[in-house]
């Protein structure tokens, strides 16, 4: 790993729960600089694998709200339109970080938890399984 | 929103920064029970709109490395293997929560950053052939 | 944040040709097009040629098809643009950029160019 150099104006680490309990400013800060990140919302519809997003919604989570692909056919739609079995439309999923509250309720305390969520589909060759 | 009653439990928070700032536990629960996420791991060479994999690592931000999609070719492999211009790959991109040292270097002191990721590449029919 | 830098441009009489290079820093890790446009003096900002940085796999608008040819060497970050059989009507400023949506990209989704580079082709 990369050691990093300590910087002599942390704030004080000397919990008892340090090193896993850390603090966190909760005002985000947006690194999406050159790119308008809504820019992709109508590939669900456009992709020749078209996708459904539907509303997570969780209170006790932060982000309290995640929007969740969900691929609309088995197949995919080919050039005349049509569903085409002989290709698998199929979702593309990544683990995130989230924080939890923990404990339950409490406005000021969380811990970290690591999701899949599903983002979008995308047209796969399906692999073939021959009956052995 | 939703008014969720408070645990009398809750640390304090008679913090002078307190609601921006909040205790993380950093030992991760995974909620991935039912799924293996490597089981997509196939689909970035399979797809019609393929796509590698680049490592993104920063010692200063947590997760401190991330993997970002880059699509191979502008347009879609079509069923003969060849790249079809009038079909677009494009990347299915999702804003992701990390954990940025703040200040730089410190081991318990974080901001929240919202960050931009390409998670993987779907072929989109084209609004215009050309770039508008 | 990204930085351009185009060079190469210059004058040349019609039928003449020229080499345009196009320097990139700071771009995202997820980069995976780069592009070439350009503006004509009272006209709109055009596409001109797209290159993909993984295949090099290259896509042209009509207009230059089969007269400009799009290169890149992904260890410089640079692209480039070789222009032959120039006409009159190629003069223009030429910009380099990231293409973050591929062929799929519209003007609107820039921020920033680069300062361009003035081509002028002489009748």
């Known amino acids: 790993g990369i050691t990093i150099p300590r910087n002599p104006g942390c704030p004080n680490s000397e919990d008892k729960n340090f090193p896993r309990t850390v603090m966190v400013n909760l005002n985000i800060h947006n690194r999406n600089t050159n790119t308008n990140p809504k820019r992709s919302s109508d590939y669900y519809n456009r992709s020749t694998s078209p996708w459904n997003l539907h509303r997570n919604e969780d209170p006790e989570r932060y982000p309290s709200v995640i929007w969740e692909a969900k691929c609309r056919h088995l197949g995919c739609i080919n050039a005349d339109g049509n569903v085409d079995y002989h290709m698998n439309s199929v979702p593309i999923q990544q683990e995130i970080l989230v924080l939890r509250r923990e404990p339950p309720h409490c406005p000021n305390s969380f811990r970290l938890e690591k999701i899949l969520v599903s983002v979008g589909c995308t047209c796969v060759t399906p692999i073939v399984h021959h009956v052995a | 929103g939703i008014t969720i009653p408070r645990n009398p439990g809750c640390p304090n928070s008679e913090d002078k920064n307190f609601p921006r700032t909040v205790m993380v536990n950093l030992n991760i629960h995974n909620r991935n029970t039912n799924t293996n996420p490597k089981r997509s791991s196939d689909y970035y060479n399979r797809s019609t709109s393929p796509w590698n994999l680049h490592r993104n690592e920063d010692p200063e931000r947590y997760p401190s490395v991330i993997w970002e999609a880059k699509c191979r070719h502008l347009g879609c492999i079509n069923a003969d293997g060849n790249v079809d211009y009038h079909m677009n790959s494009v990347p299915i991109q999702q804003e992701i929560l990390v954990l940025r040292r703040e200040p730089p270097h410190c081991p318990n002191s974080f901001r929240l950053e919202k960050i931009l990721v390409s998670v993987g590449c779907t072929c989109v029919t084209p609004i215009v052939h050309h770039v508008a | 944040q990204v930085q351009l830098v185009e060079s190469g441009g210059g004058l040349v009489q019609a039928g003449g040709s020229l080499r345009l290079s196009c320097a990139a820093s700071?771009?995202?890790?997820?980069?995976?097009?780069m592009g070439w446009f350009r503006q004509a003096p009272g006209k709109e900002r055009e596409f001109v040629a797209a290159?993909?940085?993984?295949?090099?796999?290259?896509k042209y608008a009509d207009s230059v098809k089969d007269r400009f040819t799009m290169s890149r060497d992904n260890a410089k970050k640079q692209v480039y643009l070789e222009m032959n059989s120039l006409k009159p009507e190629d003069t223009a400023v030429y910009y380099c950029?990231?293409?973050?949506?591929?062929?799929?990209?519209?003007?609107?989704?820039?921020?920033?160019w680069g300062q361009g580079i003035q081509v002028t082709v002489s009748s």
């Open positions: 290159i993909s940085w993984i295949s090099g796999g290259t």
């Open positions: 950029n990231d293409m973050p949506y591929g062929l799929d990209t519209r003007m609107d989704d820039y921020k920033y």
């Open positions: 700071g771009l995202a890790v997820s980069s995976y097009a």
